[in-house]
Interface confidence: medium
Amino acid sequence: AGHLEQPQISSTKTLSKTARLECVVSGITISATSVYWYRERPGEVIQFLVSISYDGTVRKESGIPSGKFEVDRIPETSTSTLTIHNVEKQDIATYYCALWEAQQELGKKIKVFGPGTKLIITDKQLDADVSPKPTIFLPSIAETKLQKAGTYLCLLEKFFPDVIKIHWQEKKSNTILGSQEGNTMKTNDTYMKFSWLTVPEKSLDKEHRCIVRHENNKNGVDQEIIFPPIKTDVITMDPKDNCSKDANDTLLLQLTNTSA
Amino acid sequence: AIELVPEHQTVPVSIGVPATLRCSMKGEAIGNYYINWYRKTQGNTMTFIYREKDIYGPGFKDNFQGDIDIAKNLAVLKILAPSERDEGSYYCACDTLGMGGEYTDKLIFGKGTRVTVEPRSQPHTKPSVFVMKNGTNVACLVKEFYPKDIRINLVSSKKITEFDPAIVISPSGKYNAVKLGKYEDSNSVTCSVQHDNKTVHSTDFEVKTDSTDHVKPKETENTKQPSKSCHKPKAIVHTEKVNMMSLTV
């Protein structure tokens, strides 16, 4: 089955620059299928823009200005690229790639979509670092004692743009856990968001990860915030014992035996 | 030109109570097009639900039913037993892939219908209230309450800033909420909640403990061997950007 990944959840540009949006095709050979690009402007219907067929033929929707969009595909990386030239305010939209997933029986074809890339146009000069800054909250003793469950909370602040994806996993598992989140909120020129995960008592002794996808993450990869395993009694954290082998190492919250 | 028009912009549904979305075609016969339904959830993910005839996306067949009313030129999508997972924007779209008439393999979309999910009517439930702290940050966690109306107050004399609470449906079909704030005196912050004409305090849930309750790290986590607790994630979180937590009793 065909699967589409759009690695950029957002792409921030200043006016008149060029935006390049990527779509990675897996589960199907890109040179044996057509890739379609759609646009969803705020408050408007999702609209077909352009497609590139298995033989490289490009088809544009009528009414789309020529020279605005360029579509390409690179079989070696199984990637289709939509290039938007000379970006302007009316290009602000979420752009989706899509393909028809062939099935055996007549009519049994479905069009699957990538997760979308939001094109953001800004005239602001922002701080050098507008990646999400995490703060973690561990379960309260009262909750673990009374409810035999614990809630982890992952707060992300001072990021731009507002497009962010957060999910949770146990340390050695790829299963995405059911979590809950607040709306993304504006704070001055940046944004904040929080997500929380409630786990049963039996899972509290497992390490959990809050995984954050954002355009301005360092090196363009997902940021993982580690929540250490805990026991269902009083937990004492000592900031002096954080584990940081070098400036590139991950966050660690070390459990220590500090009594009152 | 054809146009797909949803019956409603927003449809509130209750958990477990069947709901129907309708989408009418203007300017052409709906029988000349394949109708598709998609759901867009938080984070823009567009998931395929249904396509004529009897084609369902993974996990949708048991809880969704797509149909066409030719006489009324309508596409219909029934959500048989809505759950909180079904919240999102629903789109109808059409194409004529592989069929007679004007061949088009592009999808023509209608505007979305926003489906909001509410818990079904149930006996009133008092919340549990817990406070979580880290540095100047305080979170008030309010769990498993019904109905939705609630006021959450973080009680402090030295407020820096507060944020609007997030109120969501809990997996059990009640509500959960979290309110965040920043305070200079975070250690003394408590949370009080007004719900159903009653006040509930976080202090009501505090557990009395003495030092014998404190737990050593697990045997495998020796504080002198930090490497055992360090993990290389896909990306690095710089420790200077992280508010480390200190809970002492």
Epitope: L106, G107 | A29, Y33, K53, I68, I70, K72, M99, G100
Partner: antibody
Amino acid sequence: QVQLVQSGPGLVKPSETLSLTCTVSGDSIGHYYWNWIRQPAGKGLEWIGRIYTSGSTNYNPSLKSRVTMSVDTSKNQFSLKLSSVTAADTAVYYCARSGGNFYWYFDLWGRGTLVTVSS
Amino acid sequence: QSVLTQPPSVSAAPGQKVTISCSGSSSNIGNNYVSWYQQVPGTAPKLLIYDNNKRPSGIPDRISGSKSGTSATLGITGLQTGDEADYYCGTWDSSLSAGVFGGGTKVTVL
């Protein structure tokens, strides 16, 4: 209960125009396609054409030059005109309902009108 | 000559099974849905199968339809004397932009 009631002359002279009407009773014409199908004695079915509520039509290419269909939604009826008839047009003419290219099947039929072309 | 090809006749004893084939091309059966009709002499045709294999309400499950490639098949099990009739297949032809029928098959119960 929806029914299709056919009306029109059973005898038409060669070179003249055959005219038939089909009235939808028990429901509105709705957004269906309304079709005409004929069957010469002892032979198979032949699709003549269809008309949509809006008035758009599709005709069998072999009859296209002689066929005209119309719809009157206010009267809940649709009509067939076949010009320059010959003896080869003698057949039972049926009106029938279908739902479009993806619903090209006839779930409701009129009883049929035998039209004889003879001088 | 019909665009879709059916055998002129098939027969079987009561209680037996008959199958009727209907062959076409990629522009009709190959890319569109097939329907089947029963016509008792002197009456209008009646829809038996639509969308290749679906039965309208009131049609018994001993009537079945299938499609493979550019051919379709109608099956009737537990043959009864009341099944004696002419049977027609039909579909849309994308090249002609027209509806097409088979020439019809007469079913005889021996």
